[in-house]
């Protein structure tokens, strides 16, 4: 007569993490009397995961009915399935025995892997803005995922990138995976509204990869350009300077007019207008009462930018050109007067 | 589904005897049979239970005087140094406890130890 | 080795009335649970009630029940029925597998 064999049929199961794992085990025999136990791991370390004779084991549920006359049916569900569950599941025929049970027979044991989806990829920038033409990192990561392959790509724009490196955490078995990419991308001044995008492709996914983005309206400065013109002559004894401040992101900017090396007013960026690329145009305007000055007047424009260092534009005021006039600017107040357009 | 015992009779005190329990309409090969008797007008005792190879075992006090064996078919208790308080019907039962209960029974042979 | 003790050791009853008899163990049963009821007439084998304490065999009838855990068990008839009229007895487990013992038996007679 052959003694009673434990098998378990399925060398290897693979499940989606929240899904169930049936372990199946059957034995050949109702003989010898004793429980069927379920382990995780072999040796003495190995974890319990059910016992048919005691114990409370919230998780699983037995296939079948083992208070049913003649079941060889030891197979058990497991709910709820978390990537720490994945191992090598083992059903073992325990002979009724004073004072602990003999251990008689293991199945072969049935290997569960647990497929669980990438968490979304997170994409952070550099802590601080940088200016066109410059070289920024950009990170990616994503964590929790099993089994350990895994595919990450990289976007500017629809554009693939291929300058980057990226690692899989850890490099040896574990029951769920981390990826950590880093990316390098040169920004150009039309960059404001671009986006660097991470795409993770995964089984668990079915083909509709995990994206995560990154605006470079977040990591890019564009320094503006300054330009300072006088305008024609609007009435006599005035002259009208303005401060073109093209091309500049993002909004912040102050502006200060100096006079001769000395500030005359200081104002803060209010109303823009946003150019196609994302970037903003700002003019500020000057009305010079000329009459006040007996000599030439050095006008400066001077533009702080996003807490950057002060860019400036200067322009020579000819009083000369405008004759002054006795008493023709009796009324109080100062020589400059400013305005900015809505 | 039946069990069918015979090999009872009268045996005198230190004699031996082999009980046969012969199964119809199931395998005994995946199931333990036990043995258990019946002095007249008493109650049941258990005596043991024969499974597969090294899997056999007896109550304390059967040790030694009986053994059991089985084929696919059919399973034996071999008795031996019989004393008259061994007089009973013995039965063979399908099972060996616990999640296995005897649920199929024999008639029962009954073994008269006297001289 | 465990030791079964039914009571009472004998009643008497009407058809119709709810019986209740009990086996106590000398310890607890194999997994708590390891209780098994046979029903025994006269001049026939036993038949299996009741097993894993609380698990009614194959072909009882309902009126049967079992409970229990430990050292504590009950085989309940809820309405006796004239073919109900027998000795029955509790066969408990230790932990040792060679470990079964029966209970002396309860004889239910008609009153």
């Known amino acids: 007569e052959e003694e009673l064999q434990v098998i378990q049929p399925d060398k290897s199961i693979s499940v989606a993490a929240g899904e169930s794992a049936t372990l199946h085990c059957t034995v050949t025999s109702l003989i010898p009397v004793g429980p069927i136990q379920w382990f995780r791991g072999a040796g003495p370390g190995r974890e319990l995961i059910y016992n048919q004779k005691e114990g409370h084991f919230p998780r699983v549920t037995t296939v079948s009915d083992l208070t049913k006359r003649n079941n060889m049916d030891f197979s058990i569900r497991i709910s709820n399935i978390t990537p720490a569950d994945a191992g090598t599941y083992y059903c073992v025929k325990f002979r009724k025995g004073s004072p602990d049970h003999v251990e008689f027979k293991s199945g072969a044991g049935t290997e569960l892997s647990v497929r669980a989806k990438p968490s979304a990829p997170v994409v952070s920038g550099p802590a601080a803005r940088a200016t066109p033409q410059h070289t920024v990192s950009f990170t990616c990561e994503s964590h929790g995922f099993s089994p350990r392959d895994i595919t990450l790509k990289w976007f500017k724009n629809g554009n693939e990138l291929s300058d980057f490196q990226t690692n899989v955490d850890p490099a040896g078995d574990s029951v769920s995976y981390s990826i950590h990419s880093t990316a390098k991308v040169v920004l150009t001044r039309e960059d404001v509204h671009s986006q660097v995008i991470c795409e993770v492709a995964h089984v668990t996914l079915q083909g509709d990869p995990l994206r995560g983005t990154a605006n470079l309206s977040e990591t890019i400065r564009v320094p503006p350009t300054l330009e300072v013109t006088q305008q024609p002559v609007r009435a006599e004894n005035q002259v009208n300077v303005t401060c073109q401040v093209r091309k500049f992101y993002p909004q912040r900017l102050q502006l200060t007019w100096l006079e001769n090396g000395n500030v005359s007013r200081t104002e803060t960026a209010s109303t823009l207008t946003e150019n196609k690329d994302g970037t903003y145009n700002w003019m500020s305007w000057l009305l010079v009462n000329v009459s006040a000055h007996r000599d030439d007047v050095k006008l400066t424009c001077q533009v702080e930018h996003d807490g950057q260092p002060a860019v400036s534009k200067s322009h020579d005021l000819k009083v000369s050109a405008h004759p002054k006039e006795q008493g023709s600017n009796t009324a109080p107040g100062p020589a400059l007067a400013s305005a900015a357009p809505l | 589904r039946q069990l069918v015992e015979s090999g009872g009779g009268l045996v005198q005190p230190g004699g031996s005897l082999r009980l046969s329990c012969a199964a119809s309409g199931f395998s005994l090969s995946s199931h333990g049979i036990s043995w258990v008797r019946q002095a007249p007008g008493k109650g049941l005792e258990y005596i043991g239970t024969?499974?597969?190879?090294?899997i056999t075992y007896y109550a304390s006090w059967a040790k030694g005087r009986f053994t059991g064996s089985k084929t696919s078919s059919t399973a034996y208790l071999q008795m031996t140094s019989l004393r008259a308080e061994d007089t009973a019907v013995y039965y063979c039962a399908r099972g060996s406890a616990w999640n296995d209960p005897f649920d199929y029974w024999g008639q029962g042979t009954l073994v008269t130890v006297s001289s | 080795d465990i030791v079964m003790t039914q009571s009472p050791s004998s009643l008497s009853a009407s058809v119709g009335d709810r019986v209740t008899i009990t086996c106590q163990a000398s310890q607890s049963v194999y997994g708590n649970n390891d209780l098994a009821w046979y029903q025994q007439k006269p001049g026939q084998a036993p038949k299996l009630l009741i097993y894993?304490?609380?698990t009614l065999a194959t072909g009882v009838p309902s009126r049967f029940s079992g409970s229990g855990s430990g050292t504590d068990f009950t085989l309940t008839i809820s309405s006796l029925q004239p073919e109900d009229f027998a000795t029955y007895y509790c066969?408990?487990?230790?932990?040792?597998?060679?470990?079964?013992?029966f209970g002396q038996g309860t004889k239910v007679e008609i009153k």
């Open positions: 894993l304490a609380s």
């Open positions: 024969i499974g597969t190879g090294v």
């Open positions: 066969l408990g487990g230790g932990d040792d597998e060679a470990d079964n013992t």
